[in-house]
Interface confidence: low
């Protein structure tokens, strides 16, 4: 399937609008600090060049690879050295090293200001004045802050963003119409970005075998009526799509994702009865819908797994003949029977099964050795079940904010070396598992909770890799993808940690506290809580609760005072002194 001109091929397949959007996303994800206007200029130049290649595939440079064309374009940026420092050295390299170099410099935590949402009327005016620029700005701002965002999915978010403004800027109460939609897009976007980051980490850090195993388990849960060969085909195609997007090959990724959606819709009968409503939708919506589709009903007549995987005398023979295929079939069979298990649990079970076969197939009596293998699964299953039960009970007892605080204390004690902003961000997100999953029926709780926690803990791993400070975090993040969450759960108070010296400045607050939003106030308080635990890691729950209650009372008192700043200046030192005494 070779083409004389790759850029012409992708332009024709994707169409001008998607081509331009994807190139803008690609450039913004690579050069995260460049101004919007610079990127738009580069994208326009690439698009004009692509059009000349569509007209004549033999024209000069049209035979160059996309990496060569895009890399050459990025390396024309005048301020590369001043803005990006050593990233400019990438431009001295040849492909494919140059693209690898750009990928290496993607920054998961770029030093960019938080996006401020203007007044609704201002946004609607900007939307009406120049809709195209307005939407490009959205793609640019999201892509540069989320350098691994799943590019074809970002086009879908942009389409929804456009639809929200088109509808709400006509409404009588623009704000009431628009703001909830923008909040929903923001929250969904953050979740989508984090989920994709885990996929890329899985591919980049653990190889495509790890990603394929994840995909077999998840697709088998979704499509329990599909044959193993069908699931395997979907897994192969999906792996290609995500490998491309994680590598920055966004045009190929979007094109292959569209092909996968087409294939699924043409083969619904052999995949799932749930695809029908997705397949009637336009491309971007269709692909999103297929990715999010609910699990199909399980076939009624599935036999016991034990016959083929425990009782059969051919287990070792079948395993030896094609290990990965045999294990893949085991994972498929187990997953399609267990939509109530998390993907990570299913992968742990497959790993345990593999370890047992490795040991037993070399034993004198293999069958006797592996006869009880399913019994060994019980503790692996019970551990996440108990964890979800305990944490949902705690969430229901405390509510989200206090549940987050409990997790903040728990995780700060486990890994106190991690930076305070990272501990606050990660613990707040871990705490959101309660509202997201605990309200679900029992059969959906574990897959919701544990697979969500895997996504959040991957964020911790990604941030920690940039600035490693804790051997325990490195160990949990790198030793086993499927055991990351149990590894973090098993961490205890770090006895080797030398407590942080008390710094009164950390606990000095001003009247600006009073004008913060509720969320911002929570973050301030939670930041103080982390610092307290870093100062006194052995403080009891009661001691910490007492200090936090005093803190809340002190802030509330001063925010009600006539002279707020004077109150903070006077009451602040008293609060600090009382806190030190309480924790002594």
């Amino acid at each position: 399937d070779t083409h004389k001109s790759e850029v012409a091929h992708r332009f024709k397949d994707l169409g001008e609008e998607h081509f331009k959007g994807l190139v803008l996303v690609a450039f913004s994800q690579y050069l995260q600090q460049c101004p919007f206007e610079e990127h738009v200029k580069l994208v326009n130049e690439v698009t004009e060049f692509a059009k000349t290649c569509v007209a004549d595939e033999s024209a000069e440079n049209c035979d160059k690879s996309l990496h060569t064309l895009f890399g050459d374009k990025l390396c024309t940026v005048a301020t590369l050295r001043e803005t990006y420092g050593e990233m400019a050295d990438c431009c001295a390299k040849q492909e494919p090293e140059r693209n690898e170099c750009f990928l290496q410099h993607k920054d998961d935590n770029p030093n960019l200001p938080p996006l401020v949402r203007p007044e609704v009327d201002v946004m609607c005016t900007a939307f009406h004045d120049n809709e195209a620029t307005f939407l490009k700005k959205y793609l640019y701002e999201v892509a540069r802050r989320h350098p691994y965002f799943y590019a074809p999915e970002l086009l879908f978010f942009a389409a929804r963003y456009k639809a929200a403004f088109a509808e709400c800027c006509q409404a009588a109460d623009k704000a009431a119409c628009l703001l909830p939609k923008l909040d929903e897009l923001r929250d969904e976007g953050k979740a989508s970005s984090a989920k994709q980051r885990l996929k890329c980490a899985s591919l980049q850090k653990f190889g495509d075998r790890a990603f394929k195993a994840w995909a077999v388990a998840r697709l088998s849960q979704k499509f329990p009526k599909a044959e193993f060969a069908e699931v395997s085909k979907l897994v192969t195609d999906l792996t290609k799509v995500h490998t491309e997007c994680c590598h920055g090959d966004l045009l190929e990724c979007a094109d292959d994702r569209a092909d996968l959606a087409k294939y699924m819709c043409e083969n619904q009968d052999s995949i799932s009865s749930k695809l029908k409503e997705c397949c009637d939708k336009p491309l971007l919506e269709k692909s999103h819908c297929l990715a999010e589709v609910e699990n199909d009903e399980m076939p009624a007549d599935l036999p016991s797994l034990a016959a083929d995987y425990v009782e059969s005398k051919d287990v070792c023979k079948n395993y030896a003949e094609a290990k990965d295929v045999f294990l893949g079939m085991f994972l498929y069979e187990y997953a399609r029977r267990h939509p109530d298990y998390s993907v990570m649990l299913l992968l742990r079970l497959a790993k345990a099964y593999e370890a047992t076969l490795e040991k037993c197939c070399a034993a004198a009596d293999p069958h006797e050795c592996y006869a009880k293998v399913f019994d060994e699964f019980q503790p692996l299953v019970e551990e996440p079940q108990n964890l979800v039960k305990q944490n949902c009970e705690l969430f229901e007892q405390l509510g989200e904010y206090k549940f987050q605080n409990a997790l903040l204390v728990r995780y700060t004690k486990k890994v106190p070396q991690v930076s305070t902003p990272t501990l606050v961000e990660v613990s707040r997100n871990l705490g959101k598992v309660g509202a997201k999953c605990c309200k679900l029926p029992e059969a959906k709780r574990m897959p919701c909770a544990e697979d969500y926690l895997s996504v959040v803990l991957n964020r911790l791993c990604v941030l920690h890799e940039k600035t490693p400070v804790s051997e325990k975090v490195t160990k949990c993040c790198t030793e086993s993808l499927v055991n990351r969450r149990p590894c973090f759960s098993a961490l205890e108070l770090d006895e080797a940690y030398v407590p942080k010296a008390f710094n009164a400045e950390t606990f000095t607050f001003h009247a600006d506290m009073c004008t913060l939003s509720e969320k911002e106030k929570q973050v301030k308080k939670q930041t103080a809580l982390v610092e307290l635990v870093k100062h006194k890691p052995k403080a009891t729950k009661e001691q910490l609760k007492g200090v936090m209650d005093n803190f809340a009372a002190f802030v509330e008192k001063c925010c009600k005072a006539d002279d707020k700043e004077a109150c903070f200046a006077e009451e602040g030192p008293k609060f600090v002194a009382a806190s030190q005494a309480a924790l002594a």
């Epitope: 494919p96 980049q204 653990f206 190889g207 495509d208 075998r209 490693p468 490195t474 790198t478």
Partner: nanobody, 116 residues
Framework: QVQLVESGGGVVQPGGSLRLSCAAS????????MSWVRQAPGKGLEWVSS????????YYADSVKGRFTISRDNSKNTLYLQMNSLRAEDTAVYYC?????????SGQGTQVTVSS
């Protein structure tokens, strides 16, 4: 096109040393953790060692700990395995692979034979 080409294998006496190399191309080498795995005659794949993308973190199977050293040179897109104090049980085809423990090889491998 992803390519991994292993080299440096050979026949060596017990207690001897070898240095294996793996030349990588066609993918973002410096963005990926890498591993060495081996397959002894008639056995399954066995993980040997892994290194993170920056080269700062290394991991070893118990059977090779203290004898083998994994390293990488991102400027040359090359992964290395220094093998000292070799034993008969180290005889195998050695493969490099993209990813951490559990990564699957795609190259031809290089044969290491430890024999007196």
């Amino acid at each position: 096109q992803v390519q991994l080409v292993e080299s440096g294998g050979g026949v060596v006496q017990p207690g001897g040393s070898l240095r294996l190399s793996c030349a990588a191309s066609g993918f973002a080498f410096r963005g990926f953790g890498m591993s060495w795995v081996r397959q002894a005659p008639g056995k399954g794949l066995e993980w040997v060692s892994s290194i993170n993308n920056g080269g700062s973190d290394t991991y070893y199977a118990d059977s090779v700990k203290g004898r083998f050293t994994i390293s990488r040179d991102n400027s040359k897109n090359t992964l290395y395995l220094q093998m000292n104090s070799l034993r008969a049980e180290d005889t195998a085809v050695y493969y490099c692979a993209i990813g951490g423990p559990g990564a699957s090889p795609s190259g031809q491998g290089t044969q290491v034979t430890v024999s007196s």
